[in-house]
């Protein structure tokens, strides 16, 4: 499956929206930095098969959607930007779902990618626990926004690599 160009553009648009969502000066949030342990190895195209990487992207976008769909998130960000962000994520989920089912049979997906999906879920669990611990403060959300932007950037670069391999 060739990841469509529109998916990469969608990822870039999602990044732009994330960048625009900032509400407070990031400089005041330095002491709130945290090691979320982004599971980079899960997205390493050299070690893992394409279907696994795509499956991990899918889980990451799904978890991002879940994270930004909460009531606490709605209170933290601009509603218009948030709605546009949901649309981009939803479109990417559709693209990736089509891609994963084309790559391997639906039955195999769950078994084959269990470890990578679990790693992504644990990563988002750490993010959620961090936000809870910080009582969903504006700085905690800024740190999370920066983290999600970094993980999106990483996956965008890998997607370019996957397309080149085809």
């Amino acid at each position: 499956c060739d990841l469509p160009q529109t998916h990469s553009l969608g990822n870039r648009r999602a990044l732009i929206l994330l960048a625009q969502m900032g509400r407070i000066s990031h400089f005041s949030c330095l002491k709130d930095r945290y090691d979320f342990g982004f599971p980079q190895e899960v997205f390493d195209g050299n070690q893992f098969q394409k279907a696994q990487a795509i499956s991990a992207f899918h889980e990451m976008i799904q978890q991002t959607f879940n994270l930004f769909s909460t009531k606490d998130s709605s209170a933290a960000w601009d509603e218009t930007l948030l709605d546009k962000f949901y649309i981009e994520l939803f479109q990417q989920l559709n693209d990736l779902e089509a891609c994963v089912t084309q790559e391997v049979g639906v039955e195999e997906i769950a078994l084959m990618n269990e470890d990578s999906i679990l790693a992504v879920r644990k990563y988002f669990q750490r993010i959620t626990l961090y936000l809870m611990g910080k009582k969903y403060s504006p700085c905690a959300w800024e740190v999370v926004r920066a983290e999600i932007m970094r993980s999106f950037s990483f996956s965008t670069n890998l997607q370019k690599g996957l397309r080149r391999k085809d």
Partner: antibody
């Protein structure tokens, strides 16, 4: 390969203006902040200020607030440090360095080669 | 501003020696402490970040420890290329501040 390339050495007279540059390459310029550090001859490192090139938000050390201006042009991946009226005490080596912002990653992991500014009448 | 105080300001040591440099912050900075090495005419080089994480490409003889206000940089076995000036720097809050530096000289 990540690189920060600074503009060349400058010799100026007191009262003159100056703008030095720091061009980033090999990474996403807007994903990192750019900090500026001064080192006067034979002295230690002094942190001057920082800019987030994604939105040009800046922060200065109180010692340098109002003395210098930090700016960036993300379209050409370049940060700037400028003076409107130089003094002899501005004579120093100026370094730029990148910072990962709010991400959990090494601080100031890449530095420019430095720009020597000499102010003398 | 957070003040960073390094000690000693200079030291003389021989190749193979174990060298320890300390850095004290005027208030708690958690683990947001970096160590840099600078040689004459060169830009500083990051050695240790977040108090104890070794920067990629830096020899394992360099190590960092500490949290809160007291931090240490240790060179387990000094090599000829290690003679330089070392700076600590806090990145807990702006403005970032550096220690005054520790010059490591040949005995």
């Amino acid at each position: 390969e990540v690189q920060l390339v600074q503009s060349g050495a400058e010799v100026k007279k007191p009262g003159e203006s100056l703008k030095i540059s720091c061009k980033g390459s090999g990474y996403s310029f807007t994903s990192y902040w750019i900090g500026w550090v001064r080192q006067m001859p034979g002295k230690g490192l002094e942190w001057m200020g920082i800019i987030d090139p994604s939105d040009s938000d800046t922060a200065y050390s109180p010692s340098f607030q109002g003395q210098v201006t930090i700016s960036a042009d993300k379209s050409i991946s370049t940060a700037y440090l400028q003076w409107s009226s130089l003094k002899a005490s501005d004579t120093a080596m100026y370094y730029c360095a990148r910072h990962p912002g709010l991400n959990w990653a090494p601080d100031f992991d890449y530095w420019g080669q430095g720009t020597l500014v000499t102010v003398s009448s | 501003d957070i003040q960073m105080t390094q000690s000693p300001s200079s030291l003389s040591a021989s190749v193979g020696d174990r060298v320890t440099i300390t850095c004290r912050a005027s208030q708690s900075i958690s683990k947001f402490l970096n160590w840099y090495q600078q040689k004459p005419g060169k830009a500083p080089k990051l050695l240790i970040y977040f108090a104890s994480s070794l920067q990629s490409g830096v020899p394992s003889r360099f190590s960092g420890s500490g949290s809160g206000t007291d931090f240490t940089l240790t060179i387990s076995s000094l090599q000829p290329e290690d003679f330089a000036t070392y700076y600590c720097q806090q990145s807990n809050t702006l403005p970032f501040t550096f220690g005054q530096g520790t010059k490591v000289e040949i005995k």
